[in-house]
């Protein structure tokens, strides 16, 4: 008999589910890299850009060895939800300049949403708790200027690129441990 009604269905092959998540993450990483390059081309970045509201990078070379699947998936989902909100904010608030990249930003947001749904599904199949973010999402304030919003766009795409890069590495490493 299958699992009792109401309990999450544990996938017969979590590695296949993880493979699918890795593929989506890789695809999103490629989109982000391409859009970041377009941004640099259209709106040259003068140095590195930060945005206080962005999540801090969860993984580094030093932490790869100690990764655990529940922690990685939970943190990745929380961070990507934050990036999803930031991309949404960019599309609505950043001014006419970024409207020239509207199709690409719209596609990026849609793919981010798809990856978030995939991660949620993976977590439920692995019977992992669907953790909520540690603190409620801080409302994103209006950009001080068009130039400020372009700097924010550079920061968001740069941060998302790094996060996805580490996510691919982390998920591939975890797959070998399943």
């Amino acid at each position: 008999p299958g699992p009792p009604a109401g309990s999450p269905r544990v996938s017969s092959d979590p590695r296949a589910d993880l493979d699918s998540a890795v593929l989506l993450t890789r695809s999103l990483l490629a989109d982000t890299r391409q859009l970041a390059a377009q941004m640099r081309d259209k709106f040259p970045a003068d140095g590195d850009h930060n945005l206080d509201s962005l999540p801090t990078l969860a993984m580094s070379a030093g932490t790869l060895g100690s990764l655990q699947l529940p922690g990685v998936l939970t943190r990745l989902r929380v961070d990507l939800m934050s990036y999803f909100r930031h991309v949404q904010w960019l599309r609505r608030a950043a001014g006419p300049s970024l409207k020239t990249l509207e199709p690409e930003l719209g596609a990026l947001q849609a793919r981010l949403e798809r990856l978030l749904r995939r991660l949620q599904l993976l977590m439920s199949r692995l019977a992992l708790p669907q953790a909520a973010p540690d603190q409620p999402a801080v409302p994103l304030g209006p950009p001080a200027s068009a130039w400020g919003s372009i700097r924010a766009a550079h920061a968001i795409l740069g941060g998302l690129h790094l996060t996805l890069d580490w996510a691919v590495r982390g998920l591939l490493l975890l797959k070998t441990r399943l």
Partner: antibody, heavy 117, light 111 residues
Framework: QVQLVESGGGVVQPGRSLRLSCAAS????????MHWVRQAPGKGLEWVAV????????FYADSVKGRFTISRDNSKNTLYLQMNSLRAEDTAVYYC??????????WGQGTLVTVSS | QSVLTQPPSASGTPGQRVTISCSGS????????VSWYQQLPGTAPKLLIY???LRPSGVPDRFSGSKSGTSASLAISGLRSEDEADYYC???????????FGGGTKLTVLG
């Protein structure tokens, strides 16, 4: 404090040209997208055009596309609107406005353009 | 005809609460932020509300903005005689690639 001062308005015959200027002060002009908005006598506000902070992205209202050109000179803190092939329906007060995103936080006092034969 | 639809006029007595509506579509209000402007007779417009519901510093908290779906509203409570003006809503329109305005609402303070 932020100041936007339009100039260049006047009476012009249909089919002729006119160039409006907007001198900006009190803020870092090169950090802001800038718009032109017009208002015909006794009518509502009508958006005309926008130019990005760096000058390479421009959008125009359908009613002026192909006739009006928006430009800026960040070294002179000045916004321009070159108006060609003017029509009677272009008669309006023209305002320049600063925008941090999609809202206009500062407006000039306006300059009146009258197209009449 | 304006892309955003506002009632041409509205009125109220001092102290009253008045609401001005602004109706649009998915390509403007539905997917972008709404701003509101007040234009006193013979003067340039002044920003009242931006980002749907934020007030710039200096604008009294009697003015408030809200948005639901493809419609937005400006509410003015504790109406005063100096609030008599034209009010305009505005948003970016993704289909037109430009800013769109409502036709404006002339607010009259009675008595």
């Amino acid at each position: 404090q932020v100041q936007l001062v339009e100039s260049g308005g006047g009476v012009v015959q249909p089919g002729r040209s006119l160039r409006l200027s907007c001198a900006a002060s009190g803020f870092t002009f090169s950090h802001y997208d800038m718009h032109w908005v017009r208002q015909a006598p006794g009518k509502g506000l009508e958006w005309v055009a926008v130019i990005s902070y760096h000058g390479s992205v421009k959008f125009y209202a359908d009613s002026v596309k192909g006739r009006f050109t928006i430009s800026r000179d960040n070294s002179k803190n000045t916004l321009y609107l070159q108006m060609n092939s003017l029509r009677a329906e272009d008669t309006a007060v023209y305002y320049c406005a600063r925008t941090p995103g999609f809202h206009f936080d500062y407006w000039g006092q306006g300059t009146l353009v009258t197209v009449s034969s | 005809q304006s892309v955003l639809t506002q009632p041409p006029s509205a009125s109220g007595t001092p102290g009253q609460r008045v609401t001005i509506s602004c109706s649009g579509s998915s390509s403007n209000i539905g997917s972008n932020y709404v701003s509101w402007y007040q234009q006193l007779p013979g003067t340039a417009p002044k920003l009242l509300i931006y980002y749907d519901d934020l007030r710039p510093s200096g604008v009294p908290d009697r003015f408030s903005g809200s948005k639901s779906g493809t419609s937005a509203s400006l509410a003015i409570s504790g109406l005063r005689s100096e609030d008599e003006a034209d009010y305009y809503c505005s948003a970016w329109d993704d289909s037109l690639s430009g800013v769109v305005f409502g036709g404006g609402t002339k607010l009259t303070v009675l008595g």
